[in-house]
């Protein structure tokens, strides 16, 4: 698998989407896992709703969402309010019994918010009891790793 | 009606290549998994591999890895088992079976299967 | 691989029985269990699949039950037409693999 790249701005929503054969993996709930380290496992964050028929439901991790378009074949995860720490590679998995095939490998990157100089009382922060459903999602930038490249820094 | 018609009965001699065959009918070939599973004379069922014809991703047992080919023609809604170099312990019945997901279960299981090919090695 | 292990190997009852056959497997497979009947010349037939889920066709008096290691067929009233072998097999992780299967014999 190649590693597709996303960049998201602190402080702003990522969507990460991942692509795949909708009837090759039909009836197969979905998953968002993190990488720990280059050969380490692969650490569920979020998965799809529990039924299948269900899966087109957004469900919430933290500040981490899922949601599967089952008849188009598009996973889609947001990140919300992105942090350094969300940097790292992660995965897009299909699941079947305890097996989890990988849909897309994605390195997720964290740019600076340009606007973090600025006093705070000119940001705009969502209250807790706000619904994130219509809060607007910075579009992402992707791209694929390029041959050569690696995602992790290399180990001794 | 779905239907797995397997290709007939074969006798070889060790050494010798072989290939046998599985088409599908009656339903979207290209849209399940098929599993090969092979049944020595009086044994039991032994899971060989799987394989999409949509895109010819394939899963094979350890078992059976570097000793049998799975491959499949989507055009023909074919699904084929190779051996380039059979041995008596071929010996067996070889059955194809369609792996269908059922979506609240999330994993899959064989719904319909062929006939079966009965595959003999001797010298 | 995961070892699947039937238990009896053979069992002989008599028309209108109540029959059970188990099935263990060596690590929690969760309800990703098959059960298939398979009849001298014959292909294999799903039964249950998901454990406890009947496939399309087959009679009521099948039944399955079971979660993580420990699973059960049970087929309520036997007619002439259940002896057979009967096989069970783990759904949850590759390679796939099967009991060794059980044969159901008239009395």
């Known amino acids: 698998h190649n590693t597709t790249v996303f960049q998201g701005v602190a402080g702003q929503s990522l969507q990460v989407s991942c692509p795949y054969d909708s009837m090759k993996h039909w009836g197969r709930r979905k998953a968002w896992c993190r990488q720990l380290g280059e050969k380490g496992p692969c650490q569920r964050v979020v998965s799809t709703h529990n039924l299948w028929l269900l899966s087109f439901l957004r469900r919430w991790n933290g500040s981490t969402a899922i949601t599967d378009d089952t008849l188009g074949g598009t996973l889609t995860i947001t990140l919300r309010n992105l942090q350094p720490h969300d940097a790292g590679l992660y995965q897009c998995q299909s699941l079947h019994g305890s097996e989890a095939d990988t849909l897309r490998k994605v390195l997720v990157e964290v740019l600076a918010d340009p606007l973090d100089h600025r006093d705070a009382g000119d940001l705009w922060f969502p209250g807790e009891s706000e619904s994130f459903e219509d809060a607007h999602v910075e579009h992402s930038i992707s791209r694929s790793l390029l041959e050569g490249e690696i995602p992790f820094p290399p180990t001794s | 009606e779905v239907q797995l018609v397997q290709s007939g009965a074969e006798v070889k001699k060790p050494g010798e290549s072989l290939k046998i065959s599985c088409k599908g009918s009656g339903y979207s070939f290209n849209s399940y998994w098929i599993a090969w599973v092979r049944q020595m004379p009086g044994k039991g069922l032994e899971w060989m591999g799987t394989?999409?014809?949509?895109?010819?991703?394939?899963r094979l047992s350890p078992s059976f890895q570097g000793q049998v080919t799975i491959s499949a023609d989507k055009s023909i809604s074919t699904a084929y088992l190779q051996w380039s170099s059979l041995k008596a312990s071929d010996t067996a019945m070889y059955f194809c079976?369609?792996?269908?997901?059922?979506?609240?279960?999330?994993?899959?299981?064989?719904?319909?299967w062929g006939q079966g090919t009965l595959v003999t090695v001797s010298s | 691989d995961i070892q699947m292990t039937q238990s009896p190997s053979s069992v002989s009852a008599s028309v209108g029985d109540r029959v059970t056959i188990t099935c263990r497997a060596s690590?929690?497979?969760?309800?990703?269990l098959a059960w298939y009947q398979q009849k001298p010349g014959k292909a294999p037939k799903l039964l249950i699949y998901a454990a406890s889920s009947r496939q399309n066709g087959v009679p009521s008096r099948f039944s399955g039950s079971g979660s993580g290691t420990d699973f059960t067929l049970t087929i309520s009233s036997l007619q002439p037409e259940d002896f057979a072998t009967y096989f069970c097999q783990q759904a949850d992780s590759y390679p796939r693999t099967f009991g060794q299967g059980t044969k159901l014999e008239i009395k």
């Open positions: 394989i999409y014809p949509g895109d010819s991703d394939t």
């Open positions: 079976a369609r792996s269908r997901t059922f979506y609240y279960d999330s994993s899959d299981y064989f719904d319909y």
């Open positions: 690590q929690g497979i969760s309800s990703w």
